[in-house]
Interface confidence: medium
């Protein structure tokens, strides 16, 4: 996933605590395009900027997620932040991609890794095995060591996910492949959900 995702994350991380709260409240009432669902209120209100970026991209994909973020920021009077996103949108050619409603409204969109970030942080226990599978191909030595330095499984996974916004799809697939090998029943369980 590319520049749009990073731009959304940048914008949300620029919000103060109160502004982020306000952003979430407005997201609950903003007019959505036909074919798109609303992020559940309970989950939404607990999210930090990274979680919220993941959710926006998994629910609305990058192009429409970017547009929706801009709409809410403008509605909050944060024109400057919205303009920065507008620039990203124009540069990435996201306009055309945003124009279509999901071809199959029942189909899940967004990668497994994005959709199940919170559950993976909570439930993956064999983190070192996952890290070994990603070492070199996805994670640099520095990133590998940074994750290993964390004490609990949850902290390790949280650290691992801090690198995900810069990953492309192949990197996410590599993480999923590792999870399928090491935690097959967890993957199957999440896939059903």
């Amino acid at each position: 996933m590319g520049r749009a995702r990073d731009a959304i994350l940048d914008a949300l991380e620029n919000l103060s605590g109160d502004e982020l709260k306000k952003f979430k409240m407005k997201l609950l009432t903003v007019q959505l395009r036909e074919g798109y669902g609303r992020i559940p209120r309970g989950a939404l209100l607990q999210m930090d900027a990274i979680d919220l970026t993941d959710k926006l991209v998994s629910y609305y994909l990058e192009s429409y997620g970017l547009e929706l973020t801009m709409t809410v920021l403008r509605d909050m009077g944060l024109q400057e932040l919205a303009e920065q996103l507008q620039t990203t949108k124009e540069e990435s050619g996201a306009v055309a991609a945003a124009a279509s409603v999901p071809a199959q409204s029942t189909a899940r969109t967004g990668h497994f890794v994005d959709q199940h970030r919170q559950a993976l942080i909570a439930r993956v226990t064999e983190v070192d095995g996952v890290l070994d599978a990603l070492h070199g191909s996805v994670l640099t030595e520095g990133q590998y060591q940074a994750v290993r330095a964390e004490t609990t499984s949850q902290d390790k996974m949280r650290k691992l996910f801090s690198f995900v916004p810069s990953w492309n799809l192949t990197c996410k697939d590599s993480l999923l492949q590792a999870l399928k090998e090491i935690h097959p029943y967890l993957v199957m369980d999440l896939e059903q959900s």
Partner: antibody, heavy 122, light 107 residues
Amino acid sequence: QVQLQQSDAELVKPGASVKISCKVSGYTFTDHTIHWMRQRPEQGLEWIGYIYPGDASSYYNEKFKGKATLTADQSSNTAYIQVNSLTSEDSAVYFCARPLYSYASYYWFAYWGQGTLVTVSA
Amino acid sequence: DIQMNQSPSSLSASLGDTITITCHASQNINVWLTWYQQKPGNIPKLLIYKASNLHTDVPSRFSGSGSGTGFTLTISSLQPEDIATYYCQQGQSYPLTFGGGTKLEIK
């Protein structure tokens, strides 16, 4: 509806290259991977690899590294496969296909191009 | 690479019969198995994904089962339009691999 339209059959000489196109419609091109398979006469299917137009990342079957190159052009909603240094072993029908979901990598292919027959002959 | 072995390679049955095709994976693939039907001169058509889930508009006489390394595709009450070659495909790990196919003919 989702459609994948492939280019016409090709007759090529040994040692040459061929480039096949797969033009998609009916969905947002950058939301889904495009996979390529080939099927040699009277044989089964082989997976070559995928390209993800959303970020241009690709993944190849080791067997086809150096033999096939996958690309995508967002402006025309078209994916391409170029097969190099052709031999008679590369004579096959080449298919592009799209998974049912963009969700993950345990892919099941719900949408297929009609196939492009490549014949390698002197 | 994960090898997918399908058996039998060909099968002859009568209309109305119930037939079973098996697919064996060289290592555990959990439930990440897909079945396709390919009629002569046509493209493969998705029948069943994740071992047992019937794709949209696939008749209910088709069913899939299994997990781990052993999987079966069952067609009950065989119809003339079922004449085709059937392939299994694993999605557990890259490279994605297919079985060699089972060619189904009517007696």
